[in-house]
């Protein structure tokens, strides 16, 4: 977890706090979901590995006009050391697999919870 960057803020944000805030936001999205998230938009699936924050942002940044994930997009940009723009793809994308944003968020949430636990207990 020590490699995770903080958000743009008045002072440095501890990585575990930043990760916790991202998880809380994803929890809010999944709990408050009434209609299909982002109108059922599809995004590239990603490998949940070391560079997944940038990969996740690269996937989600291609979804436009979906206010529900705007905060998540901003938060992920705080974890990604380079600028990400629409249409960008990393090797971490599973390029032949597209999934709904809702499923993408659920998968990401489960993985981040696991990372958070590992950080807490190791």
């Amino acid at each position: 977890l020590t490699c995770l960057g903080g958000f743009a803020s008045p002072g440095p944000v501890p990585p575990s706090t930043a990760l916790r805030e991202l998880i809380e936001e994803l929890v809010n999205i999944t709990q408050n979901q009434k209609a299909p998230l982002c109108n059922g938009s599809m995004v590239w699936s990603i490998n949940l590995t070391a560079g997944m924050y940038c990969a996740a942002l690269e996937s989600l940044i291609n979804v436009s006009g979906c206010s529900a994930i705007e905060k998540t997009q901003r938060m992920l940009s705080g974890f990604c050391p380079h600028k990400v723009s629409a249409g960008q793809f990393s090797s971490l994308h599973v390029r032949d697999t597209k999934i709904e944003v809702a499923q993408f968020v659920k998968d990401l949430l489960l993985h981040l919870k696991k990372l958070f636990r590992e950080g807490q207990f190791n």
Partner: antibody
Framework: EVQLVQSGAEVKKPGATVKISCKVS????????MHWVQQAPGKGLEWIGG????????ASNQKFKGKATLTADKSTDTAYMELSSLRSEDTAVYYC?????FGGGPFAYWGQGTLVTVSS | DIQMTQSPSSLSASVGDRVTITCKAS??????LSWFQQKPGKAPKSLIY???RLVDGVPSRFSGSGSGTDFTLTISSLQPEDFATYYC?????????FGGGTKVEIK
């Protein structure tokens, strides 16, 4: 339905060791952290420590360092706490407790408690 | 370590009363606070998590509020089954710490 079922009451002599078990059902064992809490007779609750069953990584209260050892067996969905060098002050009810940190809190589910009595 | 100071340590109330229990943390705990109810000889039961979120199945007469260092558990209309001891817990950082407890007795 989530259940945490603990092993039965124990009576031990001072200096002895006891190992308490906590068998989980109703959720995937490795999905939630597992914690242990002490309650001495007529007293409040005190956190002993916790374990990530997936990795075996632990965190503990400094007060219980060298006293409590936490382990988890993924093959049987069971968490264990071993208490060593028992003294009369260790007489208490010990609870295992778990939950989703972000959805209900880490102490959402509780075992029924195990009474450990230390007496010569 | 974060200290959790709970007050009062005990209180007497009647059925139908509004009851308020407070918990003060020695530092900001980012609302990572739970409330528990415990009856004699039984395991604690989770009521509230994240300071104000009601656990599934818990009656709506229980509510939690507060942020930063000051938190409150409110029972809007005390019922006979609510006579018990209540504890707060901070889980913002290790070591997790409980308040000393509040015993709610029948007046």
């Amino acid at each position: 339905e989530v259940q945490l079922v603990q092993s039965g009451a124990e009576v031990k002599k001072p200096g002895a060791t006891v190992k308490i078990s906590c068998k989980v059902s109703g959720y995937t064992f490795t999905d939630y952290e597992m914690h242990w809490v002490q309650q001495a007779p007529g007293k409040g609750l005190e956190w002993i420590g916790g374990i990530d069953p997936e990795t075996g990584g632990t965190a503990s209260n400094q007060k219980f360092k060298g006293k409590a050892t936490l382990t988890a067996d993924k093959s049987t969905d069971t968490a264990y706490m071993e208490l060593s060098s028992l003294r009369s002050e260790d007489t208490a009810v010990y609870y295992c407790t778990s939950g989703d940190y972000f959805g209900g809190g880490p102490f959402a589910y509780w075992g029924q408690g195990t009474l450990v009595t230390v007496s010569s | 370590d974060i200290q959790m100071t709970q007050s009062p340590s005990s209180l007497s109330a009647s059925v139908g009363d509004r009851v308020t229990i407070t918990c003060k943390a020695s530092q900001d705990i980012n609302s990572y606070l739970s409330w528990f109810q415990q009856k004699p000889g039984k395991a604690p039961k989770s009521l509230i998590y994240r300071a104000n979120r009601l656990v599934d199945g818990v009656p709506s007469r229980f509510s939690g509020s507060g942020s930063g260092t000051d938190f409150t558990l409110t029972i809007s209309s005390l019922q006979p089954e609510d006579f018990a001891t209540y504890y707060c817990l901070q889980y913002d950082e290790f070591p997790y710490t409980f308040g000393g407890g509040t015993k709610v007795e029948i007046k």
